[in-house]
């Protein structure tokens, strides 16, 4: 049998007992479960309001999910001696609404960070780079998971949410080694123009379940290592020649385009031609038209140029109201 990917650990855990004694380096914090054998600490669904100070030095995998952290300040995980082994940090669903600059400083081995399902009204531009230098020390992050971090409308800052996230991703060019970036379910209307150029090592990019209408101003040209591009469940109407050429030019990419409201008019002709000959689109036989009404549910691969027409635009003198 095959298995979908997962990252759960089945090692035994020791429930922590609260202690009046000063914490030992390898003691388990109150309200957490620890397994030294699995190098894992789980402080899950405990309504914690701050990161435990007494995390054991052996911790490699830290789960702080389902809490009430609210704010992650600078140096939230800085310890003496540092948590030098910490490689995977999961903070999903912990009611974070603010992640400040330098929140993840002094974690030299941090490879995977999951901030999903937190309504981030404020994400500092220096959350991942740790400093406001134009070129920062490279972050060790390889996987950054930011699904559903969009705050409710009434909690949004004045600037665009897309811009706020983009600023954090490009600051100091710190994330040049990032291989995986998940940005699904964030109501993105657009992808800021220069973000991908600053993430040249990306292999996996998930932008699914957003509200992207167009990729016209997005350049994938730099992403020569990209293996998976997920664009399912957006608001894409057509992919134009420039985008098609860039995607075709990426040597290893697989593109996922399911569940977009494709508009099958004369502007779709180039994309249909490309779909028929490309090997990069996964499940391309499932792509169907959403508009115009007469084309609804037609399979894109089965269309020919005669099917793809645009209603002529009448000169103003002949238009009727």
């Amino acid at each position: 049998t095959s298995s979908a990917s997962s990252s759960s650990s089945s090692a035994p855990f020791l429930a922590s007992a609260a202690s009046a004694q000063p914490p030992l380096p390898d003691q388990c914090p109150a309200l957490c479960e620890c397994s030294e054998a699995a190098r894992t600490v789980k402080c899950v669904n405990r309504n914690l309001t701050e990161v435990p100070t007494d995390l054991p030095l052996y911790v490699r995998n830290l789960f702080l999910t389902g809490n009430q952290l609210a704010v992650l300040p600078a140096g939230a995980f800085a310890r003496r001696p540092p948590l030098a082994e910490l490689a995977a940090l999961n903070l999903s669903g912990s009611r974070l609404d603010e992640v400040r600059g330098g929140a993840f400083e002094h974690l030299p081995s941090l490879r995977q960070l999951d901030l999903s399902h937190n309504p981030l009204a404020y994400l500092s531009p220096f959350a991942f780079s740790g400093s406001n230098a134009s070129i920062s020390a490279p972050s060790p992050l390889v996987e950054l998971i930011l699904n559903h971090i969009v705050p409710p409308d009434d909690k949004r800052q004045n600037r665009s949410f897309e811009g706020m996230v983009a600023a954090a991703l490009v600051a100091g060019r710190a994330l040049q080694g990032l291989h995986l970036l998940e940005l699904a379910s964030n109501h993105f209307l657009y992808l800021p123009r220069d973000v991908l150029a600053q993430l040249p090592s990306l292999r996996y990019l998930d932008l699914s379940n957003n509200s992207l209408v167009s990729l016209t101003y997005v350049s994938f040209r730099n992403l020569t290592h990209l293996e998976s591009l997920h664009l399912e469940d957006n608001a894409l109407k057509v992919l134009h020649n420039g985008t098609l050429a860039e995607l075709q030019g990426l040597p290893h990419v697989r593109v996922f385009l399911d569940n977009n409201p494709w508009v099958c008019d004369c502007h779709m002709a180039d994309m249909v031609t490309w779909l028929k000959q490309t090997g990069v689109v996964q499940g391309k036989d499932r792509l169907t038209c959403a508009f115009p009404e007469k084309m609804r549910n037609r399979v894109l691969l089965e269309l020919n140029s005669a099917d793809l027409d645009c209603d002529p635009i009448l000169p103003p003198s002949l238009q009727t109201s």
Epitope: S5, E182, A184, E232, F256, Q282, G283, R286
Partner: nanobody
């Protein structure tokens, strides 16, 4: 239910050959690119080779170029990896992979793996 079942692994001497197979079911095999990955003891899983839907395009890790060949038979729903001139450093568990959708939705499928040991 998506299933990927690898076979063909075993013990082989340096310089020898093996052919791995991956039988796929539960999805439209011909509509998806497929990959082989491997994981050696104490190392991270790495991409070995991948092939597009109709087999028109293939890619290989630098370490196996010229020695390994990936292919597919869409009529048989089977993915292959022909491994020639095997070296000790090719020793690993080899996995077949089908990515049918976002990883976060559990749509990145893996077989159970087949062990390849290259040793004299």
């Amino acid at each position: 239910e998506v299933q990927l079942v690898e076979s063909g692994g075993g013990l082989v001497q340096p310089g020898g050959s093996l052919r791995l197979s991956c039988a796929a079911s539960g999805f439209t095999f011909s509509s998806y690119a497929m990959s082989w990955y491997r994981q050696a003891p104490g190392k991270e899983r790495e991409l070995v080779a991948s092939i597009t839907t109709a087999g028109g395009s293939t890619r290989y890790a630098d370490s196996v170029k010229g020695r390994f060949t990936i292919s597919r038979d869409n009529a048989k729903n089977t993915l292959y990896l022909q491994m020639n001139s095997l070296r000790a450093e090719d020793t690993a568990v080899y996995y077949c992979n089908a990515e049918l959708g976002p990883r976060r939705l559990g749509m990145d499928y893996w077989g159970q793996g087949t062990l390849v040991t290259v040793s004299s």
